[in-house]
């Protein structure tokens, strides 16, 4: 049979290297030789390129080399397939070399901030050595912060006569390290060069861009004063490398601004002892270049009633994230403060907190929380300067099977009944939320039975047992990941009861 007609012809001019055309050869049943027929020099010259490879995949491409390539130029390319049964020709294809030229990438040699110009870096590069002198080049510059994985892109063109191979990238974050890469193409071409090697550069430092402020209210002491733990951190979106030399804090009773107290610290938290009335706390951070904007927080009076609006809250794990969702009865509340810390018996030292706006859910990557640890999560509604009553739940980012089963006892042994009791597994051993307990029991040499009860139940009465029979009993505590058995206990039912 005749060879299949070559289809999908595609050509690329690897500038000053070769012009390579490829095609889809179709299903070959016998050895097929391909000849690429070309007219060039605007139709004034023609020649052929014949594939000489023995492997079929390499036979579907052919290259022309200098000096028989000119640009600008118009080509016609036709592929002929020949086997023992005859010759078949492809459609004639037409190519403008400027449209299919592909150059080497440019070389970035410097990325630097420009003195006194904020949030900008200047990129300097060398044009690819092998690029058509008669064409302008277009460029794509891609950039990202060092700790990000998603690139941003900006496109621009340079005139071929332009000696100045620089670009000013603006609108960046201050004092942030960026990764830069550049690619180029002949202005008329659809083929971009590969990306250049990446180069790093950093924007200039600025004054700190702001703070987020929070508090932990503790019960009033005997003298009526109340300890308040102030917590703060860099505002979201602040540069990772932003330096802070210290913090200025000032606070005063809401009723009397004249009683302002000020203090300085280099720590990221501070314990204040305030009177029973409401207070305002303000703070700024500073470095050698200036001060941040002021962050302000109102501390309510001890007897002040806080509003309640969260009606229901639940946590679940989805796609490597812990998701907390809640429902609110107050439509005007759209800012929430989330607090979370491990539920350990000691005083919580590692309190984490984060605000959420315009949403009634909060997500955290699973790997930011310890697996098999129970976390207390509280959500505070915030309306203007008021903080509402929190709603709290417990959740695990990842559950495991309990590391030990329940400690079990047998009580009230009767002729046909017995009470099985067990203790809650210590928090540190649960590894997840206990969702149920299963009691397994079996008469000596007999068939096994089981009964499952919910996690609020810590005892269960077995009935319809056999008189004067030895039993073995075991209680399993289960989380969503599976269950762990406690130790097994033996008991023997009585032969008769005092009531008989």
């Amino acid at each position: 049979a005749l060879p299949a007609k070559p289809e999908n012809i595609s050509c690329v001019y690897y500038y000053r290297k070769n012009l390579t055309c490829t095609w889809s050869p179709g299903k070959e049943t016998s050895y097929t030789q391909y000849t690429v027929k070309r007219t060039y020099a605007f139709g004034e010259k023609h020649d052929n390129c014949t594939t000489n490879s023995s492997t079929s995949e390499n036979r579907a491409s052919c290259s022309f080399f200098l000096p028989r390539i000119t640009i600008p130029d118009n080509y016609t390319i036709e592929v002929e397939a020949e086997n023992g049964d005859g010759v078949i020709k492809s459609h004639m294809t037409y190519w403008r070399l400027e449209n299919i030229a592909k150059t080497e990438p440019p070389k970035i040699f410097r990325v630097k901030p420009v003195l006194g110009i904020k949030r900008m870096i200047q990129i300097e590069w060398i044009k690819p050595e092998l690029a058509p002198v008669s064409s302008d080049l277009k460029y794509t510059l891609r950039f990202r912060t060092v700790n990000s994985t998603s690139w941003m892109e900006v496109n621009f063109a340079k005139n071929r006569k332009d000696k100045n191979q620089t670009y000013n990238l603006t609108g960046l974050q201050p004092f942030t390290e960026y990764v830069i890469a550049l690619r180029c193409a002949v202005k008329e071409s659809k083929f971009w060069s590969d990306w250049s090697q990446e180069k790093m550069g950093m924007t200039e430092e600025e004054a700190p861009c702001g703070l987020e402020l929070w508090r932990v209210l503790k019960p009033a002491e005997a003298d009526g004063r109340r300890p308040v733990r102030l917590l703060w951190k860099k505002a979201r979106g602040a540069p990772v490398l932003e330096k802070t030399l210290g913090y200025n804090i000032w606070y005063y009773p809401e009723s009397n601004t004249n009683l302002t107290e000020t203090m300085n610290t280099t720590n990221q938290q501070l314990e204040l002892h305030l009177g029973g009335e409401s207070f305002w706390v303000s703070m700024i951070s500073y470095n050698s270049l200036g001060k941040s904007p002021v962050a302000t927080l109102r501390i309510p009076a001890i007897q002040e009633k806080s509003f309640q609006c969260i009606e229901v809250m639940q946590a679940c794990v989805a796609e490597d994230q812990l998701v907390v969702k809640w429902q609110s009865s107050a439509l005007d509340v759209n800012t929430w403060m989330i607090e979370w810390f491990p539920d350990v018996d000691s005083e919580p030292t590692t309190l984490s907190w984060e605000s959420v706006s315009q949403a009634t859910n909060w997500t955290i990557q699973q790997d930011k929380l310890k697996p098999f640890w129970c976390y207390n999560i509280s959500v505070y509604p915030m309306l203007h300067d008021k903080v509402g009553e929190p709603y709290s739940i417990q959740a695990y980012a990842k559950e495991g099977v309990p590391s030990e089963g329940p400690e079990t006892k047998v009580e009230n042994i009767g002729v046909k009944t017995v009470t099985i009791t067990w203790k809650e597994i210590p928090k540190s051993e649960r590894k997840g939320i206990i969702c149920n307990y299963t009691i397994f029991y079996q008469a000596e040499g007999g068939k096994g039975f089981s009964k499952t009860v919910n996690s609020s139940i810590l005892q269960y009465g077995l009935e319809s047992l056999k008189r004067k029979t030895s039993y073995i009993v075991q209680v399993m505590a289960s989380t969503s990941a599976g269950g762990t058995n406690g130790t097994s206990i033996n008991f023997k039912t009585l032969s008769f009861s005092v009531f008989e």
Partner: antibody
Framework: QVQLVQSGAEVKKPGASVKVSCKAS????????LNWVRQAPGQGLEWMGL????????DYNPQFQDRVTITADESTSTAYMELSSLRSEDTAVYYC??????????????WGQGTLVTVSS | DIQMTQSPSSLSASVGDRVTITCQAS??????VAWYQQKPGKAPKLLIY???TEAQGVPSRFSGSGSGTDFTLTISSLQPEDFATYYC?????????FGGGTKVEIK
């Protein structure tokens, strides 16, 4: 800047061979074709052949086909022209010359300084 | 092979003169002609290619014209540094051939 520096003058006996080198600098060696042209004393220019250092492809003037070999060493950016079976009429200045224009194939834009080869018994 | 016949083989002219050198190809070579200038003891220098395109850095007094088989190099106003030998060359395909040269001397 683009430069082609050729090896020094040679004196050879008839029947011998000569190998002239041409070291390129200031550009991407594999991106341009190198030609060899000779000029006998008081005579015109005669093209001998070319090499494309990118793929090692050569093209020779049929007049020299069986006597000339043009090679290129990418690692040193150097091209070589070897002419064998020398006779007295091969006495000439031998030039290497690089093409340079995208829209002008086979044009000789940059030339070496020339190498005088004298064939004499 | 394509033969290139150049004329005249020599000419005498004065500074400021308009000088014309012609070259005839033995077959149609479209516009694939280049012109070179060579001074004694020096390598040739490319002046014109594609019959009429000036090479980089070439003074505008040098111009080329023609297509097919007949080509011309014109120096509009001869300068002292223009006294040299001029060669035409076809760059249609290999083998490349040159004209015999035209020596421009001071009158």
């Amino acid at each position: 800047q683009v430069q082609l520096v050729q090896s020094g003058a040679e004196v050879k006996k008839p029947g011998a061979s000569v190998k002239v080198s041409c070291k390129a600098s200031g550009y991407t060696f594999t991106g341009y074709v190198l030609n060899w042209v000779r000029q006998a004393p008081g005579q015109g220019l005669e093209w001998m052949g070319l090499i494309n250092p990118y793929n090692g492809g050569t093209d020779y003037n049929p007049q020299f086909q069986d006597r000339v070999t043009i090679t290129a060493d990418e690692s040193t950016s150097t091209a070589y022209m070897e002419l064998s079976s020398l006779r007295s009429e091969d006495t000439a200045v031998y030039y290497c010359a690089r093409d340079g224009y995208d829209d002008g194939p086979y044009t000789l834009e940059t030339w070496g300084q020339g190498t005088l080869v004298t064939v004499s018994s | 092979d394509i033969q290139m016949t150049q004329s005249p083989s020599s000419l005498s002219a004065s500074v400021g003169d308009r000088v014309t050198i012609t070259c005839q190809a033995s077959e149609d070579i479209y516009s694939f002609v280049a012109w070179y200038q060579q001074k004694p003891g020096k390598a040739p220098k490319l002046l014109i290619y594609n019959a009429q395109t000036e090479a980089q850095g070439v003074p505008s007094r040098f111009s080329g014209s023609g297509s097919g088989t007949d080509f011309t190099l014109t120096i509009s106003s001869l300068q002292p540094e223009d006294f040299a030998t001029y060669y035409c060359q076809h760059h249609y395909d290999s083998p490349l051939t040159f004209g015999g040269g035209t020596k421009v001397e001071i009158k």
